[in-house]
Amino acid sequence: AVNGTSQFTCFYNSRANISCVWSQDGALQDTSCQVHAWPDRRRWNQTCELLPVSQASWACNLILGAPDSQKLTTVDIVTLRVLCREGVRWRVMAIQDFKPFENLRLMAPISLQVVHVETHRCNISWEISQASHYFERHLEFEARTLSPGHTWEEAPLLTLKQKQEWICLETLTPDTQYEFQVRVKPLQGEFTTWSPWSQPLAFRTKPAALGKDT
């Protein structure tokens, strides 16, 4: 392992998974590294092997239990270390005392569906996946709609500042194909970030009735 510029970032999905990314410029692709988790008040230790995801980036998931089990709480601290093999010994490359509920990134919302579609509007609902009951209603969402001829990056963001698992899109164009995505973020945690975007949901508005203004 070479001493290039390195970065170690981990997030807790609020239930039973800690996902980590380790990046290091100049590191050899075949360097063997792992993440070791040592909780302060639990009986388990966990290790996962860092696997390459790009030229200088490795990732792994610490799976702490069944997907919907609540394995950590707001008072837990898990010491996370990146260990890389150097000859016959392991070297600590990064260490952090990880507070799970300060470093949240939830799973992407799932089960997107069109509840009702008209010529100019569409009502869409979704569900959150593997989210802790601790949040109660303290979640927010961002949504975006892909219009024809545009990119996702150009799509304006719609913010839902409460736990609302539906949206009514308005001022749509009749008989037009759209795509919709949503992501979620807990309000808690200094280093908490948005979930990945959901899988896009494709829908088409109804055509305008013949002889009527649009």
Partner: nanobody, 126 residues
Framework: QVQLVESGGGLVQPGGSLRLSCAAS????????MSWVRQAPGKGLEWVSS????????YYADSVKGRFTISRDNDKNTLYLQMNSLKPEDTAVYYC???????????????????RGQGIQVTVSS
């Protein structure tokens, strides 16, 4: 804004002890790795010791290993450096420093230092 205020320095004889303190404010203290660095007269900044956010990982420069102990009290937002068996070469201005995240990188101990205090003078002389 981040504030780090060191105290506890002074003049001490070789072989003596001092305990430095650093009162932190303006950020969530327990979320960040912290360190002590020092600057001897006419020299550059030298890393001394680091500690992770909950104090579960501690690291030391070879020059102070076995003599200095870093610790923290997250309830009091305070970082400490207990210095024993002091030597004349420990004479320096000591700075309390905050890293830019909760992560500390042992191979590059000074990397990521984002803020530091005004410093406190420690003089070891007979």
């Amino acid at each position: 804004q981040v504030q780090l205020v060191e105290s506890g320095g002074g003049l001490v004889q070789p072989g003596g002890s001092l305990r430095l303190s650093c009162a932190a404010s303006g950020f969530t203290f327990s979320n960040y790795a912290m360190s002590w660095v020092r600057q001897a007269p006419g020299k550059g900044l030298e890393w001394v010791s680091s500690i992770t956010g909950a104090g579960r990982g501690t690291y030391y420069a070879d020059s102070v290993k076995g003599r200095f102990t870093i610790s923290r009290d997250n309830d009091k937002n305070t970082l400490y450096l207990q210095m024993n068996s002091l030597k004349p070469e420990d004479t320096a201005v000591y700075y309390c420093a905050k890293y830019d995240s909760s992560t500390y990188y042992p191979p590059t101990p000074a990397r990521g230092i984002a803020d530091r205090g005004q410093g406190i003078q420690v003089t070891v002389s007979s």
